[in-house]
Interface confidence: low
């Protein structure tokens, strides 16, 4: 029979090779069929008999058609700091993958061999950019005008709002407190509105702790970053 | 095992330029706060400044102007470019490494340090 | 500009002495302090962050206290390897600041 129509086990025509989910078997010089995924081969084809397949046992598996002798072992049970998201069958590998919060630090060909927790970003920083399946966060400190005041891995900096009277400048970790209703809120990010009175300096200036500040007092332009003020809260 | 190594020291005249290197293994830089100190013989520890994450470099007041912190993340090295040196900048200058302490991205503390590299400015 | 002092600049000490310094920030700097030990020809080592956490393989006989303005370090019974000068440093604030550093203390032997 031509090669085309053949069934396993056949001899290639010279030159030729075997048809799609078959292989080229070395010891029997013939072309035999391959094992379905969930099977492996249990016996080897001859010249007058195929290829024999028996399905994988438990905790093992084959993902491709293939003629290994034994199925693959499924990976370890994922760690505590992962979580299953496939399963371990017949025909497929367990997948670990990183839980929320979590970001792979060292991958493997699938899933996550490593996790390590999302860097937290402390009071006065904020999210610059985002965790990713396969990043960690990184941190920035807030600029001129914004602050964040959470120890957070998703939180970026926030401006701070505009008071008619400023009680307390806002810094790089906590809001500006307003001695008036109805603050706003900063529509651009940077911008900053001054107490008054204000005592400037060079560009890069930290706000002075001044916990029981008299009326009138001068205060210093809140910019850069800062870590945070004990017990200090948002207004 | 986490290392700090700093090179490019040596003696400069005055009014001269120096770039110190500080080569880091074990971690990668970009993750950290990396600090810049120097010591005088004879003398206590003095903070030149600080790069962090984002790779904005931070100055004592003393350093703005003259010095310059940078960092190649691709080499995994920290840099300190010193210009228009003095006698008075003559010291052991050391990179260090913020802790990291709690998952924070600045824990305001610094280990490891490198083992230092002597800079001599003079005539 | 937070200026960080500390005091003795130096001490005589024995072994076995419970030893103490102190060192002052000009501003509230809450709990962000360190304390290092330095050995002549040597690197700083970290002792204390946050004021009064051990940091790793640290003896347990180095304690840290305070917070606010005013912090102390103590070894509770001296040994012959703490001979070293112990500095002081606020993580705090790194702009438009001076010195981080205390002015160290020499501990000697006595």
């Known amino acids: 029979l031509p090669a085309q129509v053949a069934f396993t086990p056949y001899a290639p025509e010279p030159g030729g090779t075997c048809r799609l989910r078959e292989y080229y078997d070395q010891t029997a010089q013939m072309c035999c069929s391959k094992c379905p995924p969930g099977q492996h081969a249990k016996v080897f084809c001859t010249k007058t008999s195929d290829t024999v397949c028996d399905s994988c046992e438990d905790s093992t598996y084959t993902q491709l058609w293939n003629w290994v002798p034994e199925c693959l072992s499924c990976g370890s049970r994922c760690s505590s700091d992962q979580v299953e998201t496939q399963a371990c069958t017949r025909e497929q590998n367990r997948i670990c993958t990183c839980r929320p919060g979590w970001y792979c630090a060292l991958s493997k060909q699938e899933g996550c061999r490593l996790c390590a927790q999302l860097r937290k970003c402390r009071p006065g920083f904020g999210v610059a950019r985002p965790g990713t399946e396969t990043s960690d966060v990184v941190c920035k400190p807030c600029a001129p005008g914004t602050f964040s005041n959470t120890t957070s891995s998703t939180d970026i900096c926030r401006p701070h709002q505009i008071c008619h009277v400023v009680a307390i400048p806002g810094n790089a970790s906590m809001d500006a407190v307003c001695t008036s209703t109805s603050p706003t809120r900063s529509m651009a990010p940077g911008a900053v509105h001054l107490p008054q009175p204000v005592s400037t300096r060079s560009q890069h200036t930290q706000p002075t702790p001044a916990p029981s500040t008299a009326p009138g007092t001068s205060f210093l332009l809140p910019v850069g970053p800062s870590p945070p003020a004990e017990g200090s809260t948002g207004d | 095992e986490v290392q700090l190594v700093e090179s490019g020291g040596g003696l400069v005249q005055p009014g001269g330029s120096l770039r110190l290197s500080c080569a880091a293994s074990?971690?990668?830089?970009?993750?950290?706060?990396m600090t810049w100190v120097r010591q005088a013989p004879g003398k206590g520890l003095e903070w030149v400044g600080i790069?962090?994450?984002?790779?904005?470099?931070y100055y004592a007041t003393w350093a703005k102007g003259r010095f310059t912190i940078s960092r190649d993340n691709s080499k995994n090295t920290l840099y300190l470019q010193m210009n228009s040196l003095r006698a008075e900048d003559t010291a052991v200058y050391y990179c260090?490494?913020?802790?990291?302490?709690?998952?924070?991205?600045?824990?305001?503390?610094?280990?490891?340090w490198g083992q230092g590299t002597l800079v001599t400015v003079s005539s | 500009d937070i200026q960080m002092t500390q005091s003795p600049s130096s001490v005589s000490a024995s072994v076995g002495d419970r030893v103490t310094i102190t060192c002052q920030a000009s501003?509230?700097?809450?709990?962000?302090l360190a304390w290092y030990q330095q050995k002549p020809g040597k690197a700083p080592k970290l002792l204390i962050y946050?004021?009064?956490k051990l940091a790793s393989g640290v003896p347990s006989r180095f304690s840290g206290s305070g917070s606010g303005t005013d912090f102390t370090l103590t070894i509770s019974s001296l040994q012959p390897e703490d001979f070293a000068t112990y500095y002081c440093?606020?993580?705090?604030?790194?702009?438009?600041?001076?010195?981080?550093f205390g002015g160290g203390t020499k501990v000697e032997i006595k």
């Open positions: 440093q606020q993580g705090y604030i790194y702009i438009d600041v001076g010195n981080i």
């Open positions: 790069i962090n994450t984002g790779g904005d470099s």
């Open positions: 074990g971690f990668s830089l970009s993750d950290y706060f």
């Open positions: 260090a490494r913020d802790t990291g302490y709690g998952g924070y991205d600045y824990a305001g503390s610094f280990d490891p």
């Open positions: 946050e004021a009064s």
């Open positions: 501003e509230n700097i809450n709990s962000w």
